[in-house]
């Protein structure tokens, strides 16, 4: 796969993943009422990171925000923080990667600068994806713990009426947002890895600039430091490079000059 394609695909995959992270963070269905083996309630409860909602049998849905910071579980706060950090890093990653894209020309930015930016954005996407995956996993773990705790005391005594009064223990299970978050985090991570791989292809080879052209009578022969390995192609750089009179310039360099195909 060419460097440009790898970089472009990495960017697109990261972008999709990033959009998914935002969607998951905003979604209300992080946890949904478990309907299996439960008293059948005429209401359906579900909760997000920012508010809890109830859908009645008529379809009427009412949501209430968590208007407190101190009263919320530390784990929920941690998940919120992880998701926000993931989004912030993703935004920075996108901005950096836009400038790093090989198909976009900005001033006289050389390939080494683009390579560094590509690597930076790749790392940002990787961390962003990891933040999302950790955040979602922490929430999922919290749900599993609470689920088994509430199953253990499905009905808790409420006193009154001779101690016979029962309260319905609403058990919660994984909501759609968790799956969106896991997939989105994974995509962002994969996209970041692709950007890092693309960075390697973008990095200019130092030997290209150390090459010297000698004009022998009758023919053009390129001599490179490194002896036999350089000419036989068994060295570290096995790609076929053309050497031109105008100095050492690779095929990749040739592409970096605007052609009529560069502007899409």
């Amino acid at each position: 796969m060419s460097v440009t394609a790898c970089q472009g695909l990495g960017f697109v995959v990261s972008l999709i993943g990033f959009a998914g992270i935002i969607a998951a963070t905003c979604m209300d269905q992080w946890s949904t009422q478990d309907l299996y083996n439960n008293p059948v309630t005429a209401v359906f409860n579900y909760q997000g990171l920012w508010r809890s909602c109830v859908r009645e049998s008529s379809g009427f849905t009412e949501c209430r925000g968590y208007f407190t910071l101190l009263g919320l579980p530390a784990m929920l706060q941690a998940v919120r923080a992880l998701m926000i950090v993931g989004i912030v890093l993703g935004v920075i990653g996108i901005l950096v990667s836009i400038f790093a894209l090989k198909c976009i020309r900005i001033g006289s930015m050389d390939d080494s600068a683009k390579a560094k930016m590509t690597l930076t954005s790749g790392i940002l996407f990787i961390i962003s994806g990891i933040c999302a995956i950790i955040g979602v996993s922490v929430f999922a773990n919290m749900l599993v713990t609470n689920f088994w705790m509430s199953t253990a005391n499905m009905y808790s005594g409420m006193g009154g009426m001779g101690g016979m009064v029962q309260t319905v223990q609403t058990r919660y299970t994984f909501g759609a947002a968790l799956f969106v978050g896991w997939v989105a985090g994974g995509l962002t991570l994969i996209g970041g890895v692709m950007m890092c791989i693309a960075c390697r292809g973008l990095t200019p080879d130092d030997s290209n600039f150390k090459a010297v052209s000698y004009h022998a009578s009758g023919q053009n022969v390129a001599y490179r430091p490194g002896g036999f390995k350089a000419s036989t192609g068994f060295g570290s750089n096995t790609r076929n490079k053309k050497i031109y009179d105008g100095g050492a310039r690779t095929e990749d360099d040739e592409q970096s000059h605007p052609t009529k195909y560069d502007y899409v």
Partner: antibody, heavy 119, light 113 residues
Framework: VVQLVESGGDFVQPGGSRKLSCAVS????????MHWVRQAPEKGLEWVAY????????YYADTVKGRFTVSRDNPKNSLFLHMTSLRSEDTAMYYC????????????WGQGTPLTVSS | DIVMTQSPSSLTVTAGEKVTMSCKSS????????????LTWYQQKPGQPPKLLIY???TRESGVPDRFTGSGSGTGFTLTISSVQAEDLAFYYC?????????FGLGTKLELR
Amino acid sequence: VVQLVESGGDFVQPGGSRKLSCAVSGFTFSSFGMHWVRQAPEKGLEWVAYISSGTTNIYYADTVKGRFTVSRDNPKNSLFLHMTSLRSEDTAMYYCVRSGYYGNSLDYWGQGTPLTVSS
Amino acid sequence: DIVMTQSPSSLTVTAGEKVTMSCKSSQSLFNSGNQRNYLTWYQQKPGQPPKLLIYWASTRESGVPDRFTGSGSGTGFTLTISSVQAEDLAFYYCQNVYIYPLTFGLGTKLELR
């Protein structure tokens, strides 16, 4: 004006079957869940069955489970209650009721259709 | 199933008097998700179908006079008529609308002295 008109109530022998109908008008029938509620002579109200707007959720009272079937025909604005293995204790006034938009309330009630199960 | 217990079974009052009737459920009807109680009150006059009075334990249905007030939470609920009128003579039923099967109380009969 919301209107619910029940029909089909009659004298039935124990063990017999009957199908009650409810013709609805004045609101978008397909958007609302519907209930059947009955009231035995000189007795209180007893909830019988519920069917959601899209028929995905159907619930019955334990006393009628396995004997009664609730259904609806949204294009025809009609609600049905098919009753089998009828018993004398099923004798009651049967009401067709709309499920309210708020609070799972039962907001509009028909006038009812009487069913008598007797030999 | 949730058992709804209404008391008293009948009340004899004079016009203008304040009336209170009780409804208790065997399980809590409070939903923590939206902080609401899923209890409904109905009024049934002789020869008529029931009429919705109050939902969410305390929210009056539109068109219901403000002399009718619902209160309570969890398992204990109350319907209060601040000043009874002749047209208020009827049966009053409370209903669990939280857990299926939805269950009614046996009712409270309001009579004029």
